[in-house]
Every structure is written in structure tokens, then in C-alpha cells.
């Protein structure tokens, strides 16, 4: 068997290995060895048993989408049967104290490797043996401790495979330099060991995205509005706009980034390096937010220009790619892939990323303050209760709504919040009354709302001992 | 809807040089390889080369290598062969076709150039 | 380079007959084999991709099949618009080739 037959549904073509070559893995026109890695169809009884009390679960995962010429990394975790786990010698042990459907296990080890490994591996001193290999025949790479590793994961994506040797979790990383934008498939198979050969007790699948596109999203924060995912903002207040480039294996680390920003509001173009930018919109109605982003990334060097034609044709290169980051040699020969590639050769590509929005902004709140605080008479009977009045100005529309919030000193451990809805006019002058227990001081926090919008403001207010002889305290 | 546009015929002379356009629509342009196609007249199909929108990754058959150049410019969304030194063995019509990914097979094509070499 | 063959330069039919049309490929190119119609005056137009896939909108007339190095096209009741000239590709590598097509005429 190749590697094609056993990990996925289709032989791929030549021309899809060539045009997409990934640095350090092998073609899936490599034999597979079957006797040391069976393999099994779907649906075959033989899954049941693959694995002590129950079936094993891979779960695959990665970072993409990838900017083309960026690192893409994919994990598979392992995901064990109730009360399992990996020790740390690499055994599978049952968790202290876990029930599971056969209730609590006599023997700690779900699979004892390292016993085996101790007792029956018979070696010829090189710590090589015929059986500690991949399925192609390659030895298992003799790191420290990688006896403790007894989970085999082979990758593959675009007619070629990639092996690892490792434990319940596992990273790959994979250079997208030469990789055909758009979606491809990355399939996983996980082997364990078992005596002298493997047993196969996962297969997982996911599709990954390599784009020419910056991944870009832009988050939006303006104070008072009440809903920051709506895209709804209010007016005469600045917006925000927090620009997240998803790089997560830093490729554009030592690219200057520009951004440029139109806001649908003719303010025109504003072009800026800074990834956060404040706009405010005085106006009220839709508004297209259109962002582009530009990079200058590391990219293939554009081809020479042909030479002037010589009167006796001389052989030249079929494909002409210099890659910033590699120095394998590529097929070599009369392969009509030939790669060409110049060390010292640095070159850059713009990339751009784009981002679009309809912004809508309608009034709101924009301010809210407090003018004034009075104490108000209270009858003796409630010697331990205060009244006050707060006299609150806003600006901006008419609010429906007044909560106030009153808590410790610290405005960490919230006492009492009292919402009601509230009749205001034009003017947007308004009386809060509120009632504190007893003396201190207090945080209050009083807020504004309507539809849109939610305006805040805090004060600190001291609460003075009651005198019963005196019924009446002066405002503050 | 993908359209591939090309120009309806060139006619040009021995020894000069034509830059025949394809330009794309409806699809992403980098996200897939353009190739070119000669097909002399009352003959068969002939693949040229084709090229990466994306980064500008090029693949020739051997014989055309000294006589095809392809380029692209993203801007435009427009794919180019030039072709020189130009003999009547060139006369033929020239079609560009997008691939589906990595599959080098042909879903969208051009309508053609005919080239007219003559003196 | 991958050579393919296709044996018959002319193949006469009636309409409604059953016709198949081979290619033989130099070297196993499984399953990577294209089937396409070009009328006179057209563009080539793609019917079938890795050798048995009929593509979106191809009448199920038209039906591909084969492996290793010999592959069949089949139009199951042939139509008066079915008259064109049909090549083979291999799309299995680089460089792409194509058959030397053929013509289907009416007898």
C-alpha cells in the first residue's frame, strides 16, 4: 500500500504535490508498511477494540486562517475515555478516585508502556530496533525521553505526509509559502503503540484556510454606547476602532503596517501606522467604513526578465521561485518543477487586508453630571436612613431610564441598584432620590439610559452620623 | 459569474513580438493558476504554462521556454503572454483557462486570440 | 512528458447510439484524466475531471471512467449537438498534456 491509499479517499495528482511543497514532509507515493501499521477501513469491528474501555477521540485544531508565506500550526489533542489520563513517564493510567461504567480499577494502567519497553525490547545496543520506526521505515527520532512517547500522528494534506512521534497532545508547523490559496483539507491519523507493532485508534480531519488576504478585524468601542456589537454608535462622540491582525506566527513581526482608513462620512482618506484611531461622526445616518490594510511581506523575488534570445537556445528554469526561507534544495534535474533560489536574496511582496462596516449613528447620551446633592428631612421615627436628592444634568437625547448603583467606598461590592424609568425635558434636568442605611461613605454610580445609549458618571458621598435633635442635615 | 476576456485576433509580424491580455472577473484572481493554451488551426490542443497570480510563480513546457514570458498584473485582475520573435509555426489561437485550485483542469476558459503571423 | 493517445481521430455515430471514446496514457496518471467538448469556432468546454467526475451542468449523457494508464469517455445516447471533437488531459503533472482529440461525425 502507499501512503495515498491509507490516509485518504483519492490518489492525488503530481501537479498538487508540485504546486504546493511543504519543507520536510514526503510524498504520499511512499510505501506504507502494512505489518507494522494495519490499517482498517471505516466501519471495521476492529475499531471497537482498538483502544481499553472505549474509544479514543482526536480533536484538530489550528491557527488558521494563514497568511501565504506565514507558518500555519495544526494540534491534535487525545482525548481519553472517562477516569484516563497520560502520566508522566507516558503510560495510560485511570485517574484516583474516578467511577467509570466498570466502577474503580483494581490496576492503575490502562497501558503500561514502560514496562513494556523495559521488559521485551529486544535491541542490538544502537537503541534502534526494526519495529521503532514510522510507517514509511524512518527510524523514530531519538530525543530525550522519547521513549515516553507511544502515540504515533501522521499528517497529510496536499499529496504529501508529515510523522510525529509524541504524546496525548502534539504540534505541527507547517510553512505556507508554497501553498495554493484557499481551503485544503489536513487529515490525521494516530497509531499507539502496541507490542512490537501499532494499532490505529484515531482519525481526524479539518480544513484550514491560506489566504493572500491580511486576516484583519477591527473591534469598535465608544463610551456610552449601549451595545458594541450592534454597530449602532452615537453621535459627536469618538468611536475607537482597534485594528487585530491575526498573525499568529509573528510573519509580519518586521513589516510596516499601514492602515488607511475611509469612514463613509467624507472626512476623506486618513492613512495612519498606528493600529488604533479615534473618529467621531456628526452627523446621523449609515455610513460605509472601509479599511484596507498594507504590508510589506516577505515574498518570492519576481522572475528575471528573459534574457535577449540567444541564436542557440539554452536550457532555463521552469518555475522561477526564491524563497525567502529556505535553503533545501528543490527537485533537482530534469523535473519540470525545478526550483531556483538565491540565499541572499531578500525580497517583498505587498499584502493587503480589508476590512468593511455599515456604521449607523444616531443621538445618544453624551454626558451626564451631577449638580447637586441634598440632604432631605426625615421624620424621627427612622433615625438609621438618609435621603438624598441628586440634581442631574445631561446632554444629548432625552434618557428613559436612571439607575443608580450604590456600593462600598472602594465601588468594588455593590449595596443596592434601583432602576426606574424616568420622565425628563428638553432640558434634561432631573431629581433622583435615593436612600442610604446609615452613616459612612458611599460610591454611587448613576447612570442614564435610552435605547442607544448609557452615560455614566460616579460620585463619593459621606454619609454624616444622624443627631436625632437634628432633623434636618445641610446639602453637601 | 467567471468570465476570462481576451481581445478577438493580433496580427503581427515574423520576427516581432505580441503581448496577448487575458483579463479575469468574477472570482478571486490570486486564489488560482491561469494557464495558456495554443491550438494552431485544424490541430490539437497544446498547453503552454501558466502562472500564480498570487506571487508570480511561473511554469513553462520546455520549448516555449525562450519564446513565452507570462506576467500578470493583480490591479487589473489581467493575465499576459508575451510572445517573441515571432515565426508562422506561431499563427494559432491562444486561450487562457483557470484551473480549479489544485487541479489543473479546466473549468473557465478564454474565448482566444488568433494570432496572425504574416508579413 | 506523459504522453496520451487517444486511437481514434474520427469516430462516425447516429443519433441515439451508445459511443465510447478512449485515451491511453504513457504512465499511470489515475485518476487524473479531463474530458472536454470543443465545437467549431468555441472554446474548449470541460465535461469530465479526475477521470469520472462529470462536471456542474454536464447532461448525465456524458459519463467518464478508467485508471492506471487507459480511460474511457462515454456519451450513453448521442445528440445532434454531441457532434464536436473531444480531447483527453491528464492533470496529474506538470507538463499537462492533452490527446490528439476525436471528432465525432454522423455516419
Known amino acids: 500500500k502507499r501512503f495515498h491509499d491509507v490516509l485518504g479517499n483519492e490518489r492525488p495528482s503530481a501537479y498538487m504535490r508540485e504546486h504546493n511543497q511543504l519543507n520536510g514532509w514526503s510524498s504520499d507515493e511512499n510505501d506504507w508498511n502494512e505489518k507494522l501499521y494495519p490499517v482498517w477501513k471505516r466501519g471495521d469491528m476492529r475499531w471497537k477494540n482498538s483502544w481499553k474501555g472505549g474509544r479514543v477521540q482526536a480533536v484538530l485544531t489550528s491557527d488558521s486562517p494563514a497568511l501565504v508565506g506565514s507558518n500555519i500550526t495544526f494540534a491534535v489533542n487525545l482525548i481519553f475515555p472517562r477516569c484516563q489520563k497520560e502520566d508522566a513517564n507516558g503510560n495510560i493510567v485511570y485517574e484516583k478516585n474516578c467511577r467509570n461504567e466498570a466502577g474503580l480499577s483494581a490496576d492503575p494502567y490502562v497501558y503500561n508502556w514502560t514496562a513494556w519497553s523495559e521488559d521485551s525490547d529486544g535491541e542490538n545496543g544502537t537503541g534502534q530496533s526494526h519495529h521503532n520506526v514510522f510507517p514509511d521505515g524512518k527510524p523514530f527520532p531519538h530525543h530525550p525521553g522519547w521513549r515516553r512517547w507511544n502515540f504515533i500522528y501522521v499528517f497529510h494534506t496536499l499529496g504529501q505526509y508529515f510523522q510525529k512521534l509524541g504524546r496525548c497532545s502534539v504540534r505541527v508547523s507547517v510553512n505556507t509559502a508554497n501553498v495554493t490559496l484557499g481551503p485544503q483539507l489536513m487529515e490525521v491519523t494516530v497509531y499507539r503503540r502496541h507490542g512490537r507493532a501499532y494499532v490505529p485508534i484515531a482519525q481526524v480531519k479539518d480544513v484550514y484556510v491560506v489566504t493572500d488576504q491580511i486576516p484583519v478585524f477591527v473591534t469598535m468601542f465608544q463610551k456610552n454606547d449601549r451595545n458594541s456589537s450592534d454597530e449602532t454608535f452615537l453621535k459627536d462622540l469618538p468611536i475607537m476602532f482597534d485594528v487585530l491582525i491575526h498573525d499568529p506566527s509573528h510573519f509580519l513581526n518586521y513589516s510596516t503596517i499601514n492602515y488607511k482608513w475611509s469612514f463613509g462620512d467624507n472626512t476623506g482618506l486618513f492613512v495612519s501606522t498606528n493600529h488604533t484611531v479615534n473618529h467621531t461622526y456628526v452627523l446621523n445616518g449609515t455610513f460605509s467604513l472601509n479599511l484596507t490594510v498594507k504590508a510589506a511581506a516577505p515574498g518570492p523575488c519576481p522572475p528575471p526578465p528573459p534574457p535577449p534570445r540567444p541564436s542557440k537556445p539554452t536550457p532555463s528554469l521552469a518555475t522561477t521561485l526564491k524563497s525567502y526561507d529556505s535553503n533545501t534544495p528543490g527537485p533537482a534535474g530534469d523535473n519540470p518543477l525545478e526550483l531556483s533560489r538565491i540565499p541572499d536574496e531578500n525580497c517583498q511582496i505587498n499584502r493587503y487586508g480589508h476590512f468593511q462596516a455599515t456604521i449607523t449613528i444616531v443621538e445618544g447620551i453624551l454626558e451626564v453630571n451631577i449638580i447637586q446633592m441634598t440632604d432631605v428631612l426625615m421624620p424621627v421615627p427612622w433615625p438609621e436612613s438618609s435621603l438624598i436628592d441628586f440634581v442631574v444634568t445631561c446632554q444629548g437625547s432625552i434618557p428613559t431610564e436612571v439607575c443608580t448603583i450604590i456600593s462600598d467606598p472602594t465601588c468594588e461590592i455593590t449595596q443596592n441598584t434601583v432602576c426606574s424609568p424616568v420622565d425628563v425635558d428638553e432640558m434634561c434636568l432631573l431629581t433622583v432620590r435615593r436612600t442610604f442605611n446609615g452613616s459612612g461613605t458611599y460610591c454611587v454610580n448613576l447612570t442614564l439610559g435610552d435605547d442607544t445609549s448609557l452615560a455614566l458618571t460616579s460620585t463619593l458621598i459621606s454619609v454624616p452620623d444622624r443627631d436625632p435633635a437634628s432633623p434636618l442635615r445641610m446639602a453637601n | 459569474q467567471v468570465q476570462l476576456q481576451q481581445p478577438g485576433a493580433e496580427l503581427v509580424k515574423p520576427g516581432a513580438s505580441v503581448k496577448l491580455s487575458c483579463r479575469a472577473s468574477?472570482?478571486?484572481?490570486?486564489?488560482?493558476?491561469l494557464h495558456w493554451v495554443k491550438q494552431r488551426p485544424g490541430q490539437g490542443l497544446e498547453w503552454i504554462g501558466e502562472i500564480n497570480p498570487s506571487d508570480g510563480r511561473t511554469n513553462y513546457i520546455e520549448k516555449v521556454k525562450t519564446k513565452a514570458t507570462l506576467t500578470v498584473d493583480k490591479s487589473s485582475s489581467t493575465a499576459y503572454m508575451q510572445l517573441s520573435s515571432l515565426t508562422s509555426e506561431d499563427s494559432a489561437v491562444y486561450y487562457c483557462a483557470r484551473s480549479g485550485g489544485n487541479y489543473a483542469w479546466f473549468a473557465y476558459w478564454g474565448q482566444g486570440t488568433l494570432v496572425t503571423v504574416s508579413a | 512528458d506523459i504522453v496520451m493517445t487517444q486511437s481514434h481521430k474520427f469516430m462516425s455515430t447516429s443519433v441515439g447510439d451508445r459511443v465510447s471514446i478512449t485515451c491511453k496514457a504513457s504512465?499511470?496518471?489515475?485518476?487524473?484524466v479531463a474530458w472536454y467538448q470543443q465545437r467549431p469556432g468555441q472554446s474548449p468546454k470541460l465535461l469530465i475531471y479526475?477521470?469520472?467526475y462529470r462536471y456542474t451542468g454536464v447532461p448525465d449523457r456524458f459519463t467518464g471512467s478508467g485508471s492506471g494508464t487507459d480511460f474511457t469517455f462515454t456519451i450513453s445516447s448521442v445528440q445532434a449537438e454531441d457532434l464536436a471533437v473531444y480531447y483527453c488531459q491528464q492533470h496529474y503533472s506538470i507538463p499537462l498534456t492533452f490527446g490528439a482529440g476525436t471528432k465525432l461525425e454522423l455516419k
Open positions: 479526475s477521470a469520472s
Open positions: 468574477g472570482y478571486t484572481f490570486t486564489s488560482y493558476w
Open positions: 504512465q499511470d496518471v489515475s485518476p487524473s
